[in-house]
C-alpha cells in the first residue's frame, strides 16, 4: 500500500508568493511558493496519486504582514481552502497567547490540529478541550493513517502559551500515544512536529512504532541529487535513522517559507511495515502557475492590508536617527529602539530566581535602512518601519559562549571607519572600544546586563559562560562576516519577523523617545 | 471467505473452567489486533478482553480481570480466551472480533457459554 | 449501567428520518473515535460507521455519523423496514483502558 505525503512547515504568512530568498515579491516571472501556486501543485498530485495526504508541520503564524493585520484568521482560511488535512502546532502558534491560538485558528479550521506534548491545566483545560488533539487517525483510501503531533518544549521561552500549558518532553509524551494507536491497530503512523531536526531524529529513533517523522522549527532542508535552487541540503530527503528496535525511519523536512513542497511516497506492507521511502522537496517556482480562484481570493484579502500599513502604530517625540552615518559609526537611537522592542518582544518570566531569560541583543547597524522624521506629527506608521527594516527577516533567539560574543565585538569595528553593515547596535550590553589598538583587540570593556538577579545591573562579561541573545537571523546565519555566531552558536531558535517586533512595541508603547545613552563608547 | 469462527462454548459449572478459541481464515491474521466481545442473554454488548497486533499487549475489563486470560497462535491463525473461576454472571454469546482501524470491523458468529449449577 | 448512554427505544416510519444519539464523557468519546454497529435479530454485530463519520464499504449513504465534544450520532435517513435492529455506538475508553459499548438502541420502523 502506497501513500503520498506532501507537506509544509515554517510556512510564516507567505501567503503571497515571494521572491527567492522569501522576502516581498519584486518580478513576478521570478517569483515563487505562495498559497495559490502550492494549491495548483497539491491539486495536480491529488488527481493523479490515490493516497494522499497535506500535512503542516507548524509554524504557519508569524512572519508577514498578513499576520500582523489578520493574526491567524487568514491561516485557518486558507489552511480550509487547500483541504489540509492535519497540522501540528509550532511555537510561533503561541504569537498572540492561547486566545490568539484558539479563536482565529483551533476554532476555524476545519483540519485536526495537533500536539501530544501540550497539556492543558487550570480553567484553560476545559476551554481549550477538544480543539487540539495529541493524535488523529484518518481515513486514506480503504486504510487508514494515525498522525501523533508534538511542539517544541522551548515553547515557553520562544512563545506566549502562558501558564496553563504545560509541555512535555517530545519522546515521553508521544510513547503512549503511539502505543495506544498500536492498540487500536493502527498501524502506520507519522508522528508530525515541531521541534527541530535533532529532535525529529531522535524520535524516529526512540519512539517505538513511529514509521514517518515529518518535522519543522529548524528550516532544514534535504534534497536527494542536485538542488534546485539556493538552498544547500543538511542531508539527503528523506534522512533514514535506524530506530533502537532496528526499523528505518525516514525523517522528513521542507525548509521554510512555503518555498518548497515536500513529497514523500512510502510503500508499507500489509502489517504497517515500511519497504520504501523516496521523494525530494518540490520547489514551487514560476513554472507551476499559480491557481487563479485562490489567487482572487488572496487579492481579496490583501486589500485590508494595504489600509493597514499607512495607519498609525503610535507617536515619536524625538527623530529616530537610523541614517547609516549614525548607526554603523556609533550608538544611535533608532538601534536602541530596535533593541528595546526585540528585548520587550521576548520578555517571559522564567521563574524566582531570574528576572527574564533574555537581556541581551545585537543588531547591525547596516540592517537600519532609513530614519523616521518626527515632524511628520510625530506619526508611525507600518510603511515607515518597512523602510526602515525592508528585509523581511526575524529576531532570533540564540545561545552563546561569552568568548564568542567578545569576538563578534571585535568583528563589529575590525574595519572601523569605512560604513560597514556589521557595526553592532545593542542593548542590554555597554561595550568601550579602543580604536587605537589594532583590529581584534579593540574592546576593552564589555559589560552585560544580568538575568538571573531581581535588579538588573551589569556585570563583566565572562568568556566561558553561555548566554542568550536576541538578534537578526541574518546574523544568526552569519550574515555581514559574523562567521563565529554562525559556527559557534549553541542554539538557534527563529523568533518574530522584525517589523511586527517593532510595530507592536511602538503600539505598546503609544509614545516613544529613544536616547542616545552610553551604551557604546570609545576611550 | 474472510471470517472468523469461535468454538469451545458450552454448559459449565460456577468456578469452572472454559477455553474458547477463534480460527480466522481469509486474511493475514499477524496482522491484526483482536477482541473478545460477550452478550448476555438479552442484553447488550460488553467489551471484555483485546490483545494487540504488534506487540502483544493485553487488556481486560475490570470484571473479568485476573480471571480471563487473552492469547494469540500466530501460526495457527488462532485467537484464544481462556475463562477461570466462572460465575453465573458470565454466561453469554462471546464473540470474537478483530479490530481493524481503531474499530471492531469483523466478528464471529459468536460461541454460547452457561454457567450454572 | 453502560457509561456511554443511547436511548434504549427509537421508531420512524418508512422513509423518515431517525437520529440515535450516544453520550459519553472527556476519557472516551471526548478523546477518541466513535463507531457504530447495526445488530439485527439473531445475528452478530455488523460495522456501520468507523472514526466518527466513516461509512464502511457497502453500507448505504443512508446512514451518517457524527461526533461533537463528548457525544456522537447516528443519523438513518429514508428509513427502510429493513433497519429495524439493534444499534450500538462503541468507543475506547482512556481510562479503563479498554472499548466501551453504548446500551443500545432498538429501532422500530412503524
Known amino acids: 500500500w502506497e501513500l503520498t505525503i506532501l507537506h509544509t512547515n515554517d510556512v510564516h504568512s507567505r501567503l503571497e508568493q515571494t521572491s527567492e530568498d522569501s522576502s516581498k515579491c519584486v518580478n513576478a516571472s521570478r517569483c515563487m511558493g505562495g498559497v495559490a501556486r502550492l494549491f495548483t501543485k497539491v491539486q495536480q498530485i491529488r488527481r493523479a496519486e490515490p493516497n494522499v495526504l497535506l500535512l503542516d508541520a507548524g509554524d504557519q503564524y508569524q512572519g508577514t504582514i498578513w499576520f500582523t493585520v489578520y493574526k491567524g484568521a487568514e491561516v485557518a482560511h486558507f489552511m480550509n481552502a487547500l483541504r489540509y488535512d492535519a497540522m501540528a502546532l509550532g511555537n510561533h502558534e503561541f504569537d498572540n497567547g492561547v486566545e490568539g491560538l484558539i479563536e482565529p485558528l483551533l476554532k476555524e479550521a476545519k483540519f485536526p490540529i495537533l500536539s501530544a506534548n501540550i497539556k492543558a491545566k487550570g480553567p484553560l483545560a476545559s476551554q481549550i478541550s477538544g480543539l487540539y488533539l495529541p493524535y488523529k487517525v484518518l481515513p486514506v483510501g480503504d486504510e487508514v493513517v494515525g498522525i501523533v503531533g508534538y511542539t517544541s518544549k522551548e515553547t515557553p521561552f520562544l512563545s506566549n502559551p502562558g501558564t496553563n500549558l504545560v509541555f512535555e518532553d517530545e519522546i515521553t509524551a508521544l510513547q503512549p500515544e503511539v502505543d495506544k494507536l498500536k492498540t487500536l491497530n493502527v498501524n502506520k503512523i507519522i508522528a508530525l512536529g515541531h521541534s527541530g531536526f535533532e529532535t525529529d531524529k531522535l524520535i524516529a529513533q526512540k519512539v517505538r512504532g513511529v514509521d514517518v517523522v515529518v518535522g519543522g522549527h529548524s528550516n532544514t532542508f534535504l534534497y536527494t541529487g542536485n538542488p534546485p535552487s539556493k538552498e544547500v541540503p543538511a542531508g539527503k530527503y528523506p534522512f533514514i535513522v535506524t530506530s533502537d528496535d532496528g526499523r528505518k525511519v525516514p525523517v522528513v523536512q521542507a525548509y521554510a517559507f512555503g518555498k518548497y513542497l515536500g513529497y514523500l511516497k512510502i510503500e508499507f506492507d500489509e502489517r504497517g511495515n515500511v519497504i520504501s521511502s523516496h521523494g525530494n522537496p518540490i520547489l514551487l517556482n514560476s513554472s507551476i502557475p499559480e491557481d487563479p480562484s485562490i489567487k482572487a481570493d488572496i487579492n481579496k484579502w490583501r486589500i485590508k492590508l494595504d489600509n493597514y500599513s499607512t495607519q498609525e502604530l503610535g507617536k515619536t517625540i524625538v527623530y529616530l536617527d537610523g541614517s547609516s552615518q549614525s548607526c554603523r559609526f556609533r550608538e544611535c537611537n533608532m538601534g536602541n529602539l530596535i533593541c528595546d522592542a526585540m528585548i520587550n518582544n521576548n520578555l517571559r518570566h522564567a521563574d524566582e530566581m531570574f528576572w527574564n531569560h533574555v537581556s541581551m541583543c545585537i543588531l547591525n547597524g547596516g540592517g537600519i535602512r532609513s530614519p523616521i522624521d518626527e515632524r511628520n506629527n510625530g506619526t508611525i506608521t507600518w510603511e515607515n518601519l518597512a523602510a526602515v527594516l525592508p528585509f523581511g527577516g526575524t529576531f532570533d533567539l540564540v545561545q552563546l559562549k561569552g568568548s564568542t560574543l567578545k569576538k563578534a565585538f571585535e568583528h563589529s569595528v575590525h574595519r572601523y571607519g569605512q560604513s560597514t553593515g556589521e557595526f553592532l547596535q545593542v542593548g542590554g550590553i555597554h561595550v568601550v572600544y579602543d580604536l587605537s589598538r589594532k583590529p581584534g583587540d579593540r574592546v576593552v570593556k564589555l559589560d552585560v546586563l544580568c538575568t538571573k538577579c531581581r535588579v538588573p545591573s551589569y556585570d563583566p562579561l565572562k568568556m566561558d559562560e553561555i548566554y542568550k541573545v536576541i538578534l537578526p537571523n541574518f546574523l544568526a546565519n552569519g550574515g555581514d562576516g559574523f562567521q563565529m555566531i554562525k559556527d559557534e552558536l549553541l542554539r538557534h531558535d527563529s523568533g518574530d519577523q522584525d517589523i511586527n517586533v517593532v510595530s507592536t512595541y511602538i503600539s505598546k508603547m503609544k509614545v516613544i523617545y529613544p536616547a542616545v545613552e552610553g551604551r557604546i563608547k570609545f576611550s | 471467505e474472510v471470517q472468523l469462527l469461535e468454538s469451545g462454548g458450552g454448559l459449565v459449572q460456577p468456578g469452572g473452567s472454559l477455553r474458547l478459541s477463534c480460527a480466522a481464515s481469509g486474511f493475514t491474521f499477524s496482522s491484526y489486533a483482536y477482541s473478545w466481545v460477550r452478550q448476555a442473554p438479552g442484553k447488550g454488548l460488553e467489551w471484555v478482553s483485546a490483545i494487540s497486533g504488534s506487540w502483544g499487549r493485553t487488556y481486560y475489563a475490570d470484571s473479568v480481570k485476573g480471571r480471563f486470560t487473552i492469547s494469540r497462535d500466530n501460526s495457527k491463525n488462532t485467537l484464544y480466551l481462556q475463562m477461570n473461576s466462572l460465575r453465573a454472571e458470565d454466561t453469554a454469546v462471546y464473540y470474537c472480533a478483530r479490530l481493524g482501524y481503531s474499530t471492531i470491523d469483523l466478528w464471529g458468529r459468536g460461541t454460547l457459554v452457561t454457567v450454572s449449577s | 449501567q453502560s457509561v456511554l448512554t443511547q436511548p434504549p427505544s427509537a421508531s420512524g416510519t418508512p422513509g423518515q428520518r431517525v437520529t440515535i444519539s450516544c453520550s459519553g464523557s472527556?476519557?472516551?468519546?471526548?478523546?477518541?473515535?466513535v463507531n457504530w454497529y447495526q445488530q439485527l435479530p439473531g445475528t452478530a454485530p455488523k460495522l456501520l460507521i468507523y472514526?466518527?463519520?466513516q461509512r464502511l464499504g457497502g453500507v448505504p449513504d443512508r446512514f451518517s455519523g457524527s461526533k461533537s465534544g463528548t457525544s456522537a450520532s447516528l443519523a438513518i435517513s429514508g428509513l427502510q423496514s429493513e433497519d429495524e435492529a439493534d444499534y450500538y455506538c462503541?468507543?475506547?475508553?482512556?481510562?479503563?483502558?479498554?472499548?466501551?459499548f453504548g446500551g443500545g438502541t432498538k429501532l422500530t420502523v412503524l
Open positions: 472514526l466518527n463519520n
Open positions: 472527556l476519557s472516551n468519546i471526548g478523546r477518541n473515535d
Open positions: 462503541a468507543t475506547w475508553d482512556d481510562s479503563l483502558k479498554g472499548w466501551l
